[in-house]
């Protein structure tokens, strides 16, 4: 999916009300010096793509976010505010409902978590390089 | 817990350059911008400047550029800015910020650092 | 640059009262809008995030409102530790511009 026509403004509102409380909530007794992140996004499309591949694309270690608040929280912002975005879900949400396992919260997946926080941040205030 | 902590008040010539640091600790260095502050004695807030210590990218207000040069040491996790050609309206109190973990505002900053510029 | 500008520049008011501060904005923020208190000889404090969101920490009669241009920060029932300064900033783009401020004085 191309998120380059979203509507970003309404996305970060989004994330700053609700969506980012679910993430810290979720991070809840994490030393706030344990990850560095090492995933990085240069724009917001660019963000939105490494977010929703982060949040949603089960990863070896972590293969439950999708059904976290946070998750069904930044589907909805998603679903509201791309164009388009939910059509394109519909194969993917079908695929991971057979694939569906039981929520652990491993160090893997406060790992993916951090990386999303970090996302999220560059999502919000993208430092462009200065000319 | 997450602390910024600026170096000490300096009083030097027109003319100079001096170098204020900002040495983080409690969070991961790299994660955050680090955001630079000018406020002159009885006035406001003014924006100066931005660092990614990740990266070492920069921005800097038109007003201050040529004038502020930000760096970051990833070993020590300390942010610097140096400031060249020194005058009387450079003499302010200057402080460091890092920025949220939501990316949306600043939410720690440093003591602040008072540069007196006098011959 | 975006230019933000704050009003009143100063205004008196008792304990117990409560009292608005605006922000306007020279072109449309959306809700990217950050508010800070400053007391003398301090660092300044976050206050308000996004317009509306309260920060870690901040009482409950601190409130953010306002989109595009035109904000306000309202402190209602003030109490001794209110009085100081308060600043608006745009989060916007960079550039960020602070707003002018506003000095809280007990009357």
């Known amino acids: 999916y191309d998120f380059t026509n979203c509507d970003f403004e309404k996305i970060k509102a989004a994330y700053l009300s609700t969506i980012s409380k679910d993430l810290i909530t979720y991070m809840s007794g994490t030393k706030s010096t344990e990850f560095n992140n090492t995933v990085s996004c240069s724009n917001r499309p660019h963000c939105l793509t490494e977010i929703q591949s982060l949040t949603f694309n089960p990863t070896a270690g972590c293969a439950s976010l999708a059904k976290e608040m946070f998750a069904m929280k930044t589907k909805a912002a998603l679903a509201i505010w791309c164009p388009g975005y939910s059509e394109t879900q519909i194969n993917a949400t079908q695929a991971m409902k057979k694939r569906r396992k039981r929520k652990v919260t491993t160090n893997k997946c406060l790992e993916q978590v951090s990386q999303l926080q970090g996302l999220w941040r560059r999502f919000n205030r993208p430092l462009l390089k200065q000319q | 817990q997450v602390q910024l902590q600026q170096s000490g008040a300096e009083l030097v010539r027109p003319g100079t350059s001096v170098k204020v640091s900002c040495k983080a600790s409690?969070?991961?260095?790299?994660?955050?911008?680090i955001e630079w502050v000018k406020q002159r004695p009885g006035q406001g807030l003014e924006w100066i400047g931005v660092i990614n210590p990740e990266s070492g990218d920069t921005y800097y207000s038109e007003k201050f550029k040529g004038k502020a040069t930000l760096t970051a040491d990833k070993s020590s996790s300390t942010a610097y800015m140096q400031l060249s050609s020194l005058t009387s309206e450079d003499s302010a109190v200057y402080f460091c910020?890092?920025?949220?973990?939501?990316?949306?505002?600043?939410?720690?900053w440093g003591q602040g650092t008072t540069l007196t510029v006098s011959s | 640059d975006i230019q933000m500008t704050q009003s009143p520049a100063s205004l008196s008011a008792s304990v117990g009262e409560s009292v608005t501060i605006t922000c306007r904005a020279s072109?449309?923020?959306?809700?990217?809008l950050v508010w800070y208190q400053q007391k003398q000889g301090k660092s300044p404090q976050l206050l308000v995030y996004g317009a509306r969101n309260l920060a870690d920490g901040v009482p409950s009669r601190f409130s953010g409102s306002g989109s595009g241009t035109q904000f306000s920060l309202k402190i209602n029932s003030l109490q001794p530790e209110d009085f100081g300064n308060y600043y608006c900033q745009h989060f916007y783009e960079t550039p960020l511009t602070f707003g002018t401020g506003t000095k809280l004085e007990i009357k």
């Open positions: 409690g969070y991961a260095f790299t994660n955050y911008l």
């Open positions: 910020a890092k920025e949220s973990l939501t990316g949306s505002s600043y939410d720690y």
């Open positions: 072109e449309n923020i959306y809700s990217n």
